[in-house]
Amino acid sequence: SDKLYQRKEPVISSVHTKVKGIAEVTENVTEGGVTKLGHSIFDTADYTFPLQGNSFFVMTNYVKSEGQVQTLCPEYPRRGAQCSSDRRCKKGWMDPQSKGIQTGRCVPYDKTRKTCEVSAWCPTEEEKEAPRPALLRSAENFTVLIKNNIHFPGHNYTTRNILPTMNGSCTFHKTWDPQCSIFRLGDIFQEAGENFTEVAVQGGIMGIEIYWDCNLDSWSHHCRPRYSFRRLDDKNMDESFVPGYNFRYAKYYKENNVEKRTLIKAFGIRFDILVFGTGGKF
Amino acid sequence: SDKLYQRKEPVISSVHTKVKGIAEVTENVTEGGVTKLGHSIFDTADYTFPLQGNSFFVMTNYVKSEGQVQTLCPEYPRRGAQCSSDRRCKKGWMDPQSKGIQTGRCVPYDKTRKTCEVSAWCPTEEEKEAPRPALLRSAENFTVLIKNNIHFPGHNYTTRNILPTMNGSCTFHKTWDPQCSIFRLGDIFQEAGENFTEVAVQGGIMGIEIYWDCNLDSWSHHCRPRYSFRRLDDKNMDESFVPGYNFRYAKYYKENNVEKRTLIKAFGIRFDILVFGTGGKF
Amino acid sequence: SDKLYQRKEPVISSVHTKVKGIAEVTENVTEGGVTKLGHSIFDTADYTFPLQGNSFFVMTNYVKSEGQVQTLCPEYPRRGAQCSSDRRCKKGWMDPQSKGIQTGRCVPYDKTRKTCEVSAWCPTEEEKEAPRPALLRSAENFTVLIKNNIHFPGHNYTTRNILPTMNGSCTFHKTWDPQCSIFRLGDIFQEAGENFTEVAVQGGIMGIEIYWDCNLDSWSHHCRPRYSFRRLDDKNMDESFVPGYNFRYAKYYKENNVEKRTLIKAFGIRFDILVFGTGGKF
């Protein structure tokens, strides 16, 4: 609340997060031309990345392009990419949607379709839909511990969101335990009025806002955080503006002296921890 | 503009970036003692890294040290590093410029020069100039989509830089399309009065400032971003303060049961997105 | 100091860090059932990660779980995890402390103990103490160069912490060289009243605060940074809230066509650079 006689100072903040949880993933795996159901376990080292500060990322879905090699191949026949003769293919051209540089030749992609040949990581990534339901949909049950240290340098005051009296096996609840700083990912979404299962498919960005409204006067001292949650990406976004949240990364390796990579298109939730507020003192 | 009757509140911001583009890289490749011209394709998974929030990095140049192994070897004969006898080499000494720990022996580096032997990743990294022109100089034509969600919690107001009416195939232009949030990297440099081709060699840091000056009063509501660009690293910096922008990372692998690594010194542009401004309401 | 007639504006900041140093690590290495002392060298590519912006991480300690494979195995017999019959093991159950999903069977872990079988990366990570003293305790002697570019857009004023007159071989000292921006990690801890050797074991978070109190009036212009240091993690934190600072990451590889990983639990210091202050002008 506004106390006009007070000197207000913005908060200086540092955040540390720790995600916990295991996901069992079931997907079709093709080996030697035979497709069978594969089960695998994902732990924190598999679905999250060592990230700094005010953000953490949890992978909820993925598409893999395995065994890619730098060579020539037909590009993926997405809408408008097919050709019938070399005239349609421009040597040296890089279509922003494509994954390579055109050689100028129109070549067979499969029995019925021809596309422009490209110099690229081959075979080029298929533009297939993200799996539905999401492969790591059980990430809904993961938890994140958020540690927040704050400082008002002008008032020479420091505190943190976790107090010695707190119980490490608590789970945040808006009513029953609003000071607990261990959050179930599904609960964060529920609080924000969003459906985790749905967002997990394409990914998204979720804001965890930590608001410190601190009265540092000794006679009415109060300085505890208030947590709230809101979705930060635009769920109604046009295709051309890349809805959801995903990025590509690669694992490189050598096989029979050939440099190869596995390309992973990782979909997931990026959680941004937005700390704000003021400290007021007479 | 300052409206003194308004209650001003600083912006709370979240940023999401997406880089697009492919680079063709031509460089000398040595295999089995034979040097020939090699062509390779770099896509987003090769030249950028999964990074959080307000920064993204585009690799524009690199120097590789392949097949390094942990063992003993002569250190690189940079200026002042040569020796003529063991007296010049101090067992256990770590020169901050060196890449290893001295054994105390002065050994031949090549036919004419001797340097102190070190325990290190060998052969030690050669201190050679970054390639000129930059290997990924074509990154000038890459584009970045910037999504920015902002919030004034005190005024309970949220908006974003991308509106439903926007066209996903636009490119930012200061005059013709100042609200488009897809930026060509070369244009960012041009706007900042910098030469992309030059900066790409050693790397640098470029600021993309997003200024929100929001009037949230219903009778004169205005809340759209203004983009500006400025270089953040010091181009006139003394050698000793490490000009440009680069970092080293390694790819580890096993060959014939020996742990090896390829060390990559990656030069590039780090783009910092600096969001600021206020929301005022009566 | 407060000049009430001035228009104050918060600082917009960009940070770039560069860590230097080499560590020699001595640890027990087991190969083919034989344990012997192994020496290895860690340079920046081994102990730090390409990180953005206002944070950097230095690994000071680690625990490795090598050659893990996705299969079935007994879980680690931590306190309360042992079983005597299948009744104690619940098919499909994921204990947050465990590293896998229970199959429902109680199986031998070793000669004397039985635990629930899990589907996991096997053998599961042993819950052993972080090595003491820390493996990279010599990181105390590493240095970090901090470059900070600041901007007061409203006053159209930009400056940086490194001036052309500065000497690149300086080391920060509170009294003798308070403007030098090259910091020895051990000195940062000493200034903050903390023991590097101790914190290096479990890891921690250290704040480097850069305070700009800028008077931009031409007649009494002053705008230089003031550095201070404080520990940000809670050293008295309860076990359940994960004291220190660590994260897990994995290196994946294939051996005899089997997908394997080495899991590294990395302990270290995350340094957060907290830039704040105001620019005032009449």
């Epitope: 031309g33 065994g67 090699v69 060579t71 020539l72 191949c73 037909p74 030749r105 070549v107 067979p108 992609y109 499969d110 029995k111 040949e117 081959c122 075979p123 050939v258 | - | -």
Partner: nanobody, 115 residues
């Protein structure tokens, strides 16, 4: 699924030559040859992209074997010369999406090189 039929295998003396041919039931970007020697894994021999661009050979056959294609007929040939006893194997024709990636294989044809 692409049907592949190989021909041209047989017995030949060391130093001799042999030409293998393969016909595919439909057009495909890349065609190539693999082989499996007794008690060994299947290994790549040679591959050709559309119109014979690019071509790729295993180190062990470079300079001795030549791959050629006829796009119009959906065929690929492997001209083998300077044959050695270690070239003895079943040779399989394959088709795929690049000279490194193959999805379909024929039944194979036996090549035996006697010393």
């Amino acid at each position: 699924e692409v049907q592949l039929v190989e021909s041209g295998g047989g017995l030949v003396q060391a130093g001799g030559s042999l030409r293998l041919s393969c016909a595919a039931s439909e057009r495909t970007y890349s065609m190539g040859w693999f082989r499996r020697a007794p008690g060994k894994e299947r290994e790549f021999v040679a591959g050709s992209g559309w119109d014979g661009i690019p071509t790729r050979y295993a180190d062990s056959v470079k300079g001795r074997f030549t791959i050629s294609r006829d796009n119009a007929k959906n065929t690929v040939s492997l001209q083998m010369s300077g044959l050695k006893p270690e070239d003895t194997a079943i040779y399989y024709c394959a088709t795929g999406t690049s000279v490194y990636h193959y999805q379909y294989w024929g039944q194979g044809t036996q090549v035996t090189v006697s010393s």
